[in-house]
Amino acid sequence: RDKVMSEFNNNFRQQMENYPKNNHTASILDRMQADFKCCGAANYTDWEKIPSMSKNRVPDSCCINVTVGCGINFNEKAIHKEGCVEKIGGWLRKNVL
């Protein structure tokens, strides 16, 4: 179980690196973030560490109310602050693992 979670964490972070470069990856991550109401791997600040992402933005899928451009110059109160690895991991533990 721990190995699966560790793999999921590494994979999620790898996909984050590809987010700005790959539309397919972006759409998968957007779906996960929107569906699980989460943002980033550990939390939303992970997006700040992606070199090709603008420092003041997160994907729009992180927003509580998703609209085009809502992740630009974001306010913390307007986005999901919980990380996706923990949130999706909890769902996986409960339903799959």
Epitope: N43, T45, E48, S54, K55, N56, G69, C70, I72, N73, F74, N75, E76, K77, A78
Partner: antibody
């Protein structure tokens, strides 16, 4: 009413330190990013630093990086700017500024506090 | 970093005149453009946000337009209290938050 009140400015020698404070009232402090913006005598506005709602994200202008530290105490609804290794070019009025972020502008400014760096 | 360039840097006008100040961004900033007014010895005051939205309490003679790289602030009929310095500011790509150099509006 919504208010930001700065304090802590004064005259300091080059190389010295100073700590600016900003007391917020009349609004939910944790709903906002906060900025320090300065204005040198007779000059335009220059952004210095910002800090996110929770304090998780903070950034600095290149001109102050490594010398200034921004922080906030949400329990006290207060913003701070610790300034060290001060230079003559840091002489300015320093404004504490509320920032709703997204596409909204910086909507509430303090009255400013004057920092003079001179020997 | 995104540079903001205002023109003119100073402007003389009379009460009742229609005045336009322009601001140009070095790259597209969508509509993430704000305008501020500053009077001598006072803190700046937000006039316009999101390029064209009037901040609460600001008189309707002030208006903003533009998107992408080119923006304008228009004062339809100058009043004595409008003589001040005006700044544009972008919030599309930060840090850093960048301002124009300012436009000083003086009485002719």
């Amino acid at each position: 009413q919504v208010q930001l009140v700065e304090s802590g400015g004064g005259l300091v020698k080059p190389g010295g330190s100073l700590r600016l404070s900003c007391a917020a009232s009349g609004f939910i402090f944790t709903d906002y990013f906060m900025n320090w913006i300065r204005q040198a005598p007779g000059k335009g506005l220059e952004w210095v630093s910002y800090i996110s709602n929770s304090g998780n994200i903070l950034y600095y202008a290149d001109s102050v990086k490594g010398r200034f530290t921004i922080s906030r105490d949400n329990a006290k609804a207060s913003l701070y700017l610790q300034m060290s290794s001060l230079k003559a070019e840091d002489t300015a009025v320093y404004y504490c500024v509320r920032d709703p972020r997204m596409f909204y502008g910086m909507d509430v400014w303090g009255q400013g506090t004057t920092v003079t760096v001179s020997s | 970093d995104i540079q903001m360039t205002q023109s003119p840097s100073s402007l003389s006008a009379s009460v009742g005149d229609r005045v336009t100040i322009t601001c140009r961004a070095s790259q597209s900033i969508s509509s993430y453009l704000n305008w501020y007014q500053q009077k001598p010895g006072k803190a700046p005051k937000l006039l316009i946000y999101a390029a064209s939205s009037l901040q609460s309490g600001v008189p309707s003679r002030f208006s903003g337009s533009g998107s992408g790289t080119d923006f304008t602030l228009t004062i339809s009929s100058l009043q004595p209290e409008d003589f001040a310095t005006y700044y544009c500011q972008q919030s599309y790509s930060t840090p850093p938050i960048t301002f124009g150099q300012g436009t000083r509006l003086e009485i002719k």
